[in-house]
């Protein structure tokens, strides 16, 4: 288990306990409850106060995160008598021993990575490993391959994302001959870690006094339907003096994605490239490949 | 030109089954995310199910569930609704329509309606 | 009863400024699910207007705006037009009903 649990209880105790793998807080029921209710305050002292389970025995909490150690608490009332009991949950472990500087990103739409350093204070001999658990707690991930700085995991590789959901539950914890070592924790939503490819076949076709850019939207990890995009074009005269600005145009997804613009001939060589985001989030891709249209000596 | 035709009015007696159609023209079907919905003159707008990016299936309105399946066949871009065990209360305008975005959702192009009444 | 509350009517003249509003709850606008708004002219099919909660898709007027704040979201149509006489809904997620629901729906009268 990766972290102590001490309760502050008056005598007659709820027996309070936390199962962090489901992050469901239960308590004894008590005969003739009239009202009961649990929150956790975490350091900052925010208050989190999830719904009671069916039973108003347990209460599971969805979206929080632990390593900065939090305190939970226990109200029960019934018709004889009143309840309260608190149960700390530290992060036990050498402070700074904890894996940091933690981030993923998803990218090729069904590939992730998720790096970390080891905490400062860790001994030599640390060794992290990383768990996912998605919201919906169904299952958990282990990480099925490392990526290893010395013989220590800094880093994790995942090439099957199929339990993950639109939010989850990211842990490093730590193990060491030595010394306890802290766990990092954190909650991660895919939409803001995805990295999205290039929008593909990309064609440009021209008539006369007009030129037609097309496009697909790219494929992502995240169900993301065409009005979930944005592109931005670059439409680039060739050979021109450095220091030109770049024509940058901005277009929403749609069903067709197009861009129509004048061009009449004869048309000098241009380029065009494209680049997609989440519209929400405008977190960029990387540019397509330039494709070229016009003559040299338009 | 991206189209959403759906069959024609329907009239059916109550325990029976209705099957409405949805042909997509101008797209590929298995490019798009079709929802249904039906509008009656005393519940509004009523989501029936579609699919669902979180659960990567097609889901169902509670209240409907077990008495509807919606289904596609993406050979001949189109999506299809059953509505099964027709009660008076289903009389309604039945609608398909194609996800725009997910975060929402926000139902994008709409067919024109198939009228479906119920009466013995 | 629809979870989504809007009034049943509003009016104005044309060239006018109307706004419609939008009451829902913690479970859905306040969330915070994305707020999508649909035009109905008579006897026709819903046409989206609005989607992430103040977007317009392509050939929708820029008259046609819309914003959210905390558990309420509005519409506002300005240089109100003869054509714009149509009856207007909001529609957002619910986490209590675990899925999408529209909002009663709003008469736009052009006097």
């Known amino acids: 288990e990766k972290s102590d649990l001490r309760t502050v209880a008056p005598a007659s105790s709820l027996n309070v306990r936390f199962d962090s793998r489901t992050m469901n807080l239960s308590w004894d029921c008590q005969e003739n409850t009239t009202f009961s209710k649990c929150f956790l305050t975490d350091k900052k002292n925010r208050v989190v106060e999830p719904r009671l389970s069916n039973n108003e025995c347990s209460c599971t909490f969805r979206e929080i995160c632990l390593h900065e150690g939090v305190t939970f608490e226990v109200h029960v009332n019934t018709s004889q008598r009143g309840f309260q009991q608190k149960l700390l949950y530290p992060n036990s472990g050498r402070e700074g021993t904890a894996a940091q500087n933690f981030s993923c990103f998803i990218y090729n739409a069904d590939l992730m990575n998720c790096t970390w350093a080891r905490g400062p204070t860790a001994p030599r001999d640390v060794q992290y490993f990383l768990y996912i658990r998605n919201s919906k707690r169904r299952r958990e991930i282990r990480c099925p391959y490392y990526i290893q700085d010395s013989g220590t995991h800094v880093g994790c590789h995942l090439d099957n994302l199929s339990g993950l959901t639109s939010r989850n539950y990211f842990l490093v914890n730590g193990t060491s001959r030595e010394i306890g070592i802290q766990f990092f924790d954190s909650l991660l939503d895919t939409k803001k870690i995805e990295r999205f490819n290039p929008p593909s076949n990309v064609t440009v076709r021209c008539n006369t006094t007009h030129c037609l850019v097309r496009w697909k939207q790219p494929r992502t990890y995240q169900k993301l339907s065409y009005l979930d995009f944005q592109y931005q074009l670059d439409v680039h005269r060739k050979n021109t003096q450095p220091g030109t600005e770049n024509l940058l145009i901005n277009v929403s997804g749609d069903l067709e994605n197009r861009y129509n613009f004048p061009s009449s001939e004869p048309r000098a060589k241009h380029s065009v490239k494209i680049r997609a985001a989440d519209v929400r989030i405008l977190n960029w891709s990387s540019w397509s490949e330039a494709i070229e249209f016009g003559s040299d000596d338009g | 030109q991206v189209q959403l035709v759906q069959s024609g009015a329907e009239v059916k007696k109550p325990g029976a089954s209705v099957k409405v159609s949805c042909k997509i023209s101008g797209h590929s079907l298995s490019e798009l995310f079709i929802h249904w919905v039906r509008q009656t003159p005393t519940k509004g707008f009523e989501w029936m199910g579609g699919f669902d990016p979180e659960e990567n299936e097609i889901v169902y309105a509670q209240r409907f569930q077990g008495r509807v399946t919606m289904t596609e066949d993406t050979s001949i871009d189109t999506a299809y609704l059953t509505l099964s065990s027709l009660r008076s209360d289903d009389t309604a305008v039945y609608y398909c329509s194609t996800v725009g975005s997910f975060s929402g959702p926000a139902l994008h192009l709409w067919g024109k309606g198939t009228m479906v009444t119920v009466s013995s | 009863q629809a979870v989504l509350t809007q009034p049943s009517s509003v009016s104005g003249a044309p060239g006018q400024r109307v706004t419609i509003s939008c009451t829902g709850s913690g479970s859905n606008i306040g969330a915070p699910y994305d707020v999508s708004w649909y035009q109905q002219l008579p006897g026709t099919a819903p046409k989206l207007l609005i989607y992430h909660n103040n977007k317009r898709p392509s050939g929708v007027p820029d008259r046609f705006s819309a914003s959210k704040s905390g558990t309420s979201a509005s519409l506002a149509i300005t240089g109100l037009q003869a054509d714009d006489e149509a009856d207007y809904y909001c529609?957002?997620?619910?986490?209590?009903?675990?899925?999408?629901?529209f909002g009663g729906g709003t008469k736009v009268t052009v006097l």
């Open positions: 529609q957002s997620y619910d986490s209590q009903w675990n899925q999408p629901l």
